[in-house]
Amino acid sequence: RDTTVKPGAKKDTKDSRPKLPQTLSRGWGDQLIWTQTYEEALYKSKTSNKPLMIIHHLDECPHSQALKKVFAENKEIQKLAEQFVLLNLVYETTDKHLSPDGQYVPRILFVDPSLTVRADITGRYSNRLYAYEPADTALLLDNMKKALKLLKTEL
């Protein structure tokens, strides 16, 4: 779904971390640590040397809602997501690098700790390169691993 600029199943775990308010996770994984702003996410990525995963979505978008459910309920995705700095946005940032081929939702982009948007890590749709659908969880997992693996080779 294309967007204009707009304001902006729990993981099985014995982790003792307190559950964050859903205002930050917005349902994408209540047990995960989410950053609040793009600026904070970039800072944390750089200082922790972890890749950043950014999810652009909208509350009133059926495809955002559908992807959110499979993302939150997929144990592998939730486990792997712990190795990322995480940000989900319901508004567009001013950084054009985060919309290389348009401001559609949902879309997922990866940024490495050198603050380079990983334009090479794409989904399977040629007209919306960073779009993922519920059927694409295996590809998303592969792309998350790719972002982590390439990070390690850059060290």
């Epitope: 978008c61 459910k69 059927a135």
Partner: antibody
Framework: QVQLVQSGAEVKKPGASVKVSCKTS????????MNWVRQAPGQGLEWIGW????????NYNGKFKDRVTLTADKSTSTVYMELSSLRSEDTAVYFC?????????????WGQGTLVTVSS | EIVLTQSPATLSLSPGERATLSCKAS??????LSWFQQKPGQAPRTLIY???RLVDGIPARFSGSGSGQDFTLTISSLEPEDFAVYYC?????????FGGGTKVEIK
């Protein structure tokens, strides 16, 4: 195999409420969206809303928002559609329709339909 | 709300002929379009999703194409059981909306 079995026909008076059930089997109930669609006699199809049985999240067509409530009972793998303040224009066949098996929004399987007649 | 316009309203054809049904959206809906078949007194049956993906168990004579605003359902060679009403549905944004339907009748 996937089955959606709806409750029987209902006759209601204007101003009353109706609650239609859709009992499901043959798939993981909590992980597929369930839609409700209606069809007035001799007319086309109209989307009412959807619910995610896993956590009860819903989205309604604005036309019905104040009058419709979708709920899900995981213990019986049943979804419900309740429509209140009925009027004659609500006379229609009401269908439940499951989303894609993988959690996708498209409508894949349909219930047989429940005729709701609103008449004084 | 996205409006879907189906044409023609009625298509009169003979068994064995090719049927081409159109569905036009009032705005870009990417490929988020489904096609359904409905016979009198029955529930709709899903034929196609995501514009061109055939649902399991649906005969290969049915095919879908298009993206953006213009979509087509093609039945390559009509069988007697194919005479019915066909609806398209957009699920790109809320509320989901259906086209008004195309009736395929025997000539």
């Amino acid at each position: 195999q996937v089955q959606l079995v709806q409750s029987g026909a209902e006759v209601k008076k204007p101003g009353a409420s109706v609650k239609v059930s859709c009992k499901t089997s043959g798939y993981v109930f909590s992980r597929s969206w369930m839609n409700w669609v209606r069809q007035a006699p001799g007319q086309g199809l109209e989307w009412i809303g959807w619910i995610y049985p896993g956590d009860g999240d819903t989205n309604y067509n604005g036309k019905f928002k104040d009058r419709v409530t979708l709920t899900a009972d995981k213990s019986t793998s049943t979804v419900y559609m309740e429509l209140s303040s009925l009027r004659s224009e609500d006379t229609a066949v009401y269908f439940c329709a499951r989303g894609g098996y993988d959690g996708s929004p498209w409508l894949s399987y349909w219930g047989q339909g429940t005729l709701v007649t609103v008449s004084s | 709300e996205i409006v879907l316009t189906q044409s023609p309203a009625t298509l009169s054809l003979s068994p064995g002929e090719r049927a081409t049904l159109s569905c036009k959206a009032s705005q870009d809906i990417n490929s988020y379009l489904s096609w359904f078949q409905q016979k009198p007194g029955q529930a709709p049956r899903t034929l196609i999703y995501r514009a061109n993906r055939l649902v399991d168990g649906i005969p290969a004579r049915f095919s879908g194409s298009g993206s953006g605003q213009d979509f087509t359902l093609t039945i390559s060679s009509l069988e007697p059981e194919d005479f019915a009403v066909y609806y398209c549905l957009q699920y790109d944004e809320f509320p989901f909306t259906f086209g008004g339907g195309t009736k395929v009748e025997i000539k």
